[in-house]
């Protein structure tokens, strides 16, 4: 598992300290208090395609 | 089968201290979360504090902090609690319990207890 | 801290009556709500997370309700080994989750 400071998490998710693993950035939003949100801020979403030009 | 057995409770004065076990066996200890939950005999359950699986990062109820230590040996499949300057309102079953593998969701599993009574 | 409030704190009922159980948060928790059974002497027992998730092994006449500050648990016909003590918990709040006071169920 990474540990904090190696490589960092996919596109999208960030570091759990109370998890020990990478965390999705999506809960962030229904529950902000995560400890690994604050990385969030810093770690856009994945993109995603347009559906119009 | 999942099994958590706590241990090392017990009667003791005011001020004094104690250390709890947690033996868990039936799955593999390292990856989970754990906690430790208690409650006042007919009382309700109150958390008391949560370890990360490495036990890197761990929190504490402002009720127990600077007085309580959470830590853990995964070489031994083991929890541990460690209670400093016990208070009489410190009296109570103390349960370990698994975290579920997302953060802080549930717990899924529970030990029996160990009843620690704060008494002169 | 966010405070949980269950009513009623307590409710008799017969073998084979639905059981309503509520639990009403202090502030919005999103559906990060679970519910325990414990019975006397007996560690906790998870019935359901999330709001309405069915824990593995927990029969289906247990079911559960709700979001933001309004959440239900049901048991649609109560078994003799249901009669026991209920509580929700949050895990919203993190890390200070908090429990309901419970709702014990006995015997009418």
């Known amino acids: 598992e990474q540990a904090p400071g190696t490589a960092p998490c996919s596109r999208g998710s960030s570091w759990s300290a109370d998890l020990d693993k990478c965390a999705d950035c999506a809960s962030c939003r229904a529950r902000p208090h995560s400890d690994f949100c604050l990385g969030c801020a810093a770690a856009p979403p994945a993109p995603f395609r347009l559906l119009w030009p | 089968e999942v099994q958590l057995l706590e241990s090392g409770g017990g009667l003791v004065q005011p001020g004094g201290s104690l250390r709890l076990s947690c033996a868990a066996s039936?799955?593999?200890?390292?990856?989970?979360?754990m906690m430790w939950v208690r409650q006042a005999p007919g009382k309700g359950l109150e958390w008391v504090s949560y370890i990360s699986p490495s036990g890197g990062s761990t929190h504490y109820a402002d009720s127990v902090k600077g007085r309580f230590t959470i830590s853990r040996d995964n070489s031994k499949n083991t929890l541990y609690l460690q209670m400093n300057s016990l208070r009489a309102e410190d009296t109570a079953v103390y349960y370990c319990a698994r975290g579920g593998d997302t953060y802080f969701d549930y717990f899924d599993y529970w030990g029996q207890g160990t009843l620690v009574t704060v008494s002169s | 801290d966010i405070q949980m409030t269950q009513s009623p704190s307590s409710l008799s009922a017969s073998v084979g009556d639905r059981v309503t159980i509520t639990c009403r948060a202090s502030q919005s928790i999103s559906s990060y709500l679970n519910w325990y059974q414990q019975k006397p002497g007996k560690a906790p027992k998870l019935l359901i997370y999330?709001?309405?998730s069915l824990q593995s092994g927990v029969p289906s006449r247990f079911s559960g309700s709700g979001s933001g500050t309004d959440f239900t648990l049901t048991i649609s016909s109560l078994q003799p080994e249901d009669f026991a003590t209920y509580y929700c918990q949050q895990s919203y709040s993190t890390p200070g989750i908090t429990f309901g006071q419970g709702t014990k169920v006995e015997i009418k």
């Open positions: 039936g799955f593999t200890f390292s990856p989970y979360p």
């Open positions: 999330a709001a309405s």
